[in-house]
């Protein structure tokens, strides 16, 4: 009875186990009892990344600059081209088929993690003691100014969007306080 299974780098055809083609090559003709599988290298701008029996190689991905894409890694006969986004943009999906502008963190929010070619900016609300008064894709929350270290006093309390306002100490109150 003919075989029903083959080893991993083989495939079943016409009751025969034939060798698969190596990565970077496509199938031209199946093996016979007396001839080996015939394979041919993929052409320029084509690839196959596994042991295979494909009769056509896959086209390398095109990194379309109109979509904000650029080549991160050029494809070979065994690997696809890897696209990434232009500076200031990031991929919309894992496959990186298009790009969107990095998000900015609004006032009251700071950058927790700066965006990369594949991930967007991550913002966080400024906690008590910190503020951000700008919309930015880079700025973290800044700590409120410490008036005391400058020998000043808080004239206006800070918020998550504004720094504290420091002012000179009231000398009279300062004098009474010490006596």
């Amino acid at each position: 009875e003919p075989p029903t299974a083959c080893r991993e780098k083989q495939y079943l055809i016409n009751s025969q186990c034939c060798s698969l083609c190596q990565p970077g090559q496509k199938l031209v003709s199946d093996c016979t009892e007396f001839t080996e599988t015939e394979c041919l290298p993929c052409g320029e701008s084509e690839f196959l990344d596994t042991w295979n029996r494909e009769t056509h190689c896959h086209q390398h991905k095109y990194c379309d600059p109109n979509l904000g894409l650029r080549v991160q890694q050029k494809g070979t006969s065994e690997t696809d081209t890897i696209c990434t986004c232009e500076e200031g943009w990031h991929c919309t999906s894992e496959a990186c088929e298009s790009c969107v502008l990095h998000r900015s963190c609004s006032p009251g929010f700071g950058v927790k993690q700066i965006a990369t070619g594949v991930s967007d900016t991550i913002c966080e609300p400024c906690p008590v003691g910190f503020f951000s008064n700008v919309s930015s894709a880079f700025e973290k929350c800044h700590p409120w100014t410490s008036c005391e270290t400058k020998d000043l006093v808080v004239q206006q309390a800070g918020t998550n969007k504004t720094d504290v306002v420091c002012g000179p100490q009231d000398r009279l109150r300062h004098h009474h306080h010490h006596h």
Partner: antibody, heavy 127, light 107 residues
Framework: EVQLLESGGGLVRPGGSLRLSCAAS????????MNWVRQAPGKGLEWVSY????????DYADSVKGRFTVSRDNSKNLLYLQMNSLRAEDTAVYYC????????????????????WGQGTMVTVSS | DIQLTQSPSSLTASVGDRVTITCRSS??????LAWYQQKPGKPPKLLIY???SLEGGVPSRFSGSGSGTDFTLTISSLQPEDFATYYC?????????FGQGTKLEIK
């Protein structure tokens, strides 16, 4: 050091069952296809069964089909052979053997061979 | 199933002799053939794969040739440690099969 070590052999009555184990070490077991091969006393080699690296594909010699089951646990680096409905003619030394795929520019289609063998475990089926 | 027939079944030779063992397949198997050496009480040892490629660490006095249905294993100059039993095996398709073996004995 690359090694295979069989265990679980012994004396069993006809119709009985036995489970052989093969412990692999020194290589990434889960990346290799494996086989069981047996040798009856004073006789030649007989291929018994095959299992793919994932365990998804198995095959058997006609003489054991329906009675023997090959399996593997890649997390424990173990290969098994469950032998049921044993017969006197199953008496043999059982070897586990690693399938290797050789591939280079001089051999673009590659070639298989069994490059690592255990020392074997004896199975005797007798009443 | 593919049958492999080895000849001779046994062979007596002397140290330094050139020895050839043949293996014939019942159907074409291209170059999907391996040769093994086995000594008493020991597991087989792979010598040749793909009909003609020498396994690493195997002395160059061993060579294999053939494709399709007819294969040969040649030992160019027998050494004392070469006296053993030799098996061919087809890995073309399942069930994988072995030849019946050739016992090489010292004269």
């Amino acid at each position: 050091e690359v090694q295979l070590l069989e265990s679980g052999g012994g004396l069993v009555r006809p119709g009985g069952s036995l489970r052989l184990s093969c412990a692999a070490s020194g290589f990434t077991f889960g990346s290799y296809e494996m086989n069981w091969v047996r040798q009856a006393p004073g006789k030649g080699l007989e291929w018994v069964s095959y299992i793919s690296s994932s365990g998804e594909t198995t095959d058997y010699a006609d003489s054991v089909k329906g009675r023997f089951t090959v399996s593997r646990d890649n997390s424990k680096n173990l290969l098994y052979l469950q032998m049921n409905s044993l017969r006197a003619e199953d008496t043999a030394v059982y070897y586990c053997a690693r399938d290797v795929f050789f591939f280079d520019s001089s051999r673009p289609n590659g070639a298989y061979g069994m490059d690592v063998w255990g020392q074997g475990t004896m199975v005797t089926v007798s009443s | 199933d593919i049958q492999l027939t080895q000849s001779p079944s046994s062979l007596t030779a002397s140290v330094g002799d050139r020895v050839t063992i043949t293996c014939r397949s019942s159907q074409g198997i291209r170059s999907s053939l391996a040769w093994y050496q086995q000594k008493p009480g020991k597991p087989p040892k792979l010598l040749i794969y793909g009909a003609s490629s020498l396994e690493g660490g195997v002395p160059s006095r061993f060579s294999g040739s053939g494709s399709g249905t007819d294969f040969t294993l040649t030992i160019s100059s027998l050494q004392p440690e070469d006296f053993a039993t030799y098996y061919c095996q087809q890995l073309n398709s399942f069930p994988s099969t072995f030849g019946q073996g050739t016992k090489l004995e010292i004269k």
